[in-house]
Interface confidence: medium
Amino acid sequence: EICGPGIDIRNDFQQLKRLENCTVIEGFLHILLISKAEDYRNYRFPKLTVITEYLLLFRVAGLESLGDLFPNLTVIRGWKLFYNYALVIFEMTNLKDIGLYNLRNITRGAIRIEKNADLCYLSTVDWSLILDAVSNNYIVGNKSPKECGDMCPGTLEEKPLCEKTAINNEYNYRCWTTNRCQKMCPSACGKRACTENNECCHPECLGSCHAPDDDTACVACRHYYFSGVCVPACPPNTYRFEGWRCVDRDFCANIPNADGGDSEGFVIHDGECMQECPSGFIRNGSQSMFCIPCEGPCPKVCEEDKKTKTIDSVNSAQMLQGCTIFKGNLLINIRRGNNIASELENFMGLIEVVTGYVKISHSHALVSLSFLKNLRQILGEEQLEGNYSFYVLDNQNLQQLWDWDHRNLTIKAGKMYFAFNPKLCVSEIYRMEDVTGTKGRQSKGDINTRNNGERASCESDI
C-alpha cells in the first residue's frame, strides 16, 4: 500500500498505527513531540521499505532504536528535503542507536543527527555507502564515541562478523547496533545492490532485492516503478510521478491536492505528472492538464505571510520556484552547503522584482549573488531600520555581487549597507552604486572601506 502524501505523527504514539499497511510512504514521515515515554516494542512496521521524501524524528520519548520500528526501511529517496536533509534525528532523548540495519540508500540529501544525548553507534556507520556527499552531513552534539564504547557484532568474542571500511583513514568494522552489521555488497556488483546472500541485483534495483538479476524482485527502484517492474524510464502513455513511479493520464487528472490548495489540478509536462507547470511554462487553459511555453519568464507573484521570507537552505528556496515577483522582503542566510549556487539559481533565478528589501547576511556558502540572475528591481517599499533596502553583512566568502557588464538592477527606494564582507572589493560595491542609481544615497558608514575586501586582492580604491 502506498501511503501519503506525507505522514505526520505527533503527540500520540498510537497514531503510529497509520503506518500499519504502508510499503511506500509517498512523501515525508514525521514522528515528533511524543512526550510520554511508551513501550514501542509492540509497534513494528516491517512492510515499510521506501520513503520518497525524508524522515524526521524529534523529541520522541522512550524510543531507543529505529530498527524495531522500521526493520526493512531500505531507501529514503529525498525527492523533497527538510532543509537539505533526507534524514533528521534531533533531540531524541532516549535513542540509543539508529538501528536502521536495512537502510542502504539515501538517494538525495544529507543527514542531520543532532543533540541526541544517549545516541551511540554513529561512528560505526559508513554513510558513504548509503549516500553520495557525506561532506554535507551534520552529526553534532550526540553521545561521545568514548562514552559509547561501540562494539560491532562478534568483536568481544574476537570473531568480528562485520566488514571493515575506511573513514578518514580509520579502518574499522561497520555496524548499526551491537548485533547488526552494516550490509555491504560484493565489489563484483559495482554500484548494483545485492540480496541478503550477496547475489547482485538487477541494475534497475535500488537498495536490495529478493532475487538476483530480476527487475521484478527489487525492494526499490533505481529509476521508476511501473506495474511490478523497475524500469529506466516510464513507458509510453505513462508519466513520472513523485520521482519514483509511472502513472497514467487518468490517475494524474484525478489527484486531489494534498493541501486542498488553490492549484488547478496536476499537469502533464515533459513526461511527468506534476502539481504545476515548471518554470518557463504556463497552462493553456485554467482546466488544462498541459503546459505551453511562456513569452519570456512566466509571471508568478509570490507572497510570504510574514512579509519576510528567510532563505536559509535549498529547501526554503524551493518555495520560490517560478516566482518572478516577490511581494515582501528577502532575507538570505545560507551558512553552509556545497555547490549551492546552482540549486539556488534553479529556485530563485526567475525573480525579477522584490517589492521590499533584500538582506544577505552570514551567508558563508555564497561566493556571488549571480544566482539571482534575473533580479532587475528592488522597490524598497519596506526598508530595514535605517532605511536600507539592500543590506549585505558578514558574508565571509562573497567575492562578487553580479556581473555588472550584463546586469541592469535598480533600487527604487532606500539605501545600501555593506560591512564585514572580507572578500568583497569596495570597487565592486561602488560599481553597484552606479548601476542601481543609489550613488549619493548612502551615508558615510554605510559602505565600510575597512572591513569589506580586506582579505581580497582588490585594485586600489582611490
Epitope: A253, N254, P256, N257, G260, G261, D262, S263, E264, G265, I282, R283, N284, G285, S286, Q287, I292, C294, E295, C298, P299, K300, V301, I325, K327, V353, T355
Partner: antibody, heavy 117, light 107 residues
C-alpha cells in the same frame, strides 16, 4: 487585496458593438486566468470564456464564440471583452472574475449592458 | 457540455436550521465543484472550492462535500444574512457550467 474594477453601465444600440473593460490593479494581473460571466436580469450565471493575461491564450464557451472577443492590455493591467452584433438577448450584467481552484474567487462589480434603440 | 442539476430551486427555512442544497453533475467531475452565494442586488461570492475547501473569510457554518457526480452544500445554524441564491459551478471540463441556482428564504 485583489480588486477588479468595471464600469457600471453601457447603453448600446442593436447591431452595434461594445467593449467592456476590467482593470486589475497591482501585480496580480498576469498571474490569474481572467474569466467573463453573463447574468441576465433575474436569471442564472453563464460562463463566456477565459483569457490568460500573460500570453493572451483564450478559451471560449462555444455558445459565445461568435459573440465575444477577449483581449488584454498588460501595460495597463486591463482585460477587455468585446461583444458584437448586439441584440436584446445580450442585455445583461457582465462580470469579470478570477479563479481559485477552478472556482471564481474575486468578482468585478459587473457592467450592466442595455441594448436598446 | 456537463449539465449541473441543482435542487431544490427554492427553499424556505427558519433561523438556526441546518439546510442542505444538492448539485448533481451529468458526468464525473471529480472534486472540481465550487459553490457561490449571490445576495439580491449583489455580486456573486465564492463560498467553497474544490468541493470542500472553505474560501478565505467564509464562516465555518458553510461546508461542502461530495465527489464524482453528487455534491452538497450545508449551512448549519441559518442566519438572516444567509438569504441569497446559491449556485454550484463545475470546473472539470470546458465550458464551465453553473447550476440553475437555489433561492433560500427565511420562514
Amino acid at each position: 487585496q485583489i480588486q477588479l474594477q468595471q464600469p457600471g453601465a453601457e447603453l448600446v444600440k442593436p447591431g452595434a458593438s461594445v467593449k467592456l473593460s476590467c482593470k486589475a490593479p497591482g501585480y496580480t494581473f498576469t498571474s490569474y486566468w481572467m474569466h467573463w460571466v453573463k447574468q441576465r436580469p433575474g436569471q442564472g450565471l453563464e460562463w463566456i470564456g477565459e483569457t490568460n493575461p500573460s500570453n493572451s491564450v483564450t478559451n471560449y464557451n462555444e455558445k459565445f464564440k461568435s459573440k465575444a472577443t477577449l483581449t488584454v492590455d498588460k501595460s495597463s493591467s486591463t482585460a477587455y471583452m468585446q461583444l458584437s452584433s448586439l441584440t436584446s438577448e445580450d442585455s445583461a450584467v457582465y462580470y469579470c472574475t478570477i479563479g481559485r481552484g477552478r472556482g471564481f474567487a474575486y468578482w468585478g462589480q459587473g457592467t450592466l449592458v442595455t441594448v436598446s434603440a | 457540455d456537463i449539465q449541473m442539476n441543482q435542487s431544490p430551486s427554492s427553499l424556505s427555512a427558519s433561523l438556526g436550521d441546518t439546510i442542505t442544497i444538492t448539485c448533481r453533475a451529468s458526468q464525473n467531475i471529480n472534486f472540481w465543484l465550487s459553490w457561490c452565494q449571490q445576495k439580491p442586488g449583489n455580486i456573486p461570492k465564492l463560498l467553497i472550492y474544490k468541493a470542500s475547501n472553505l474560501h478565505t473569510g467564509v464562516p465555518s457554518r458553510f461546508s461542502g462535500s461530495g465527489s464524482g457526480t453528487d455534491f452538497t452544500l450545508t449551512i448549519s445554524s441559518l442566519q438572516p444574512e444567509d438569504i441569497a441564491t446559491y449556485y454550484c459551478l463545475q470546473g472539470q471540463s470546458y465550458p464551465y457550467t453553473f447550476g440553475g441556482g437555489t433561492k433560500l428564504e427565511i420562514k
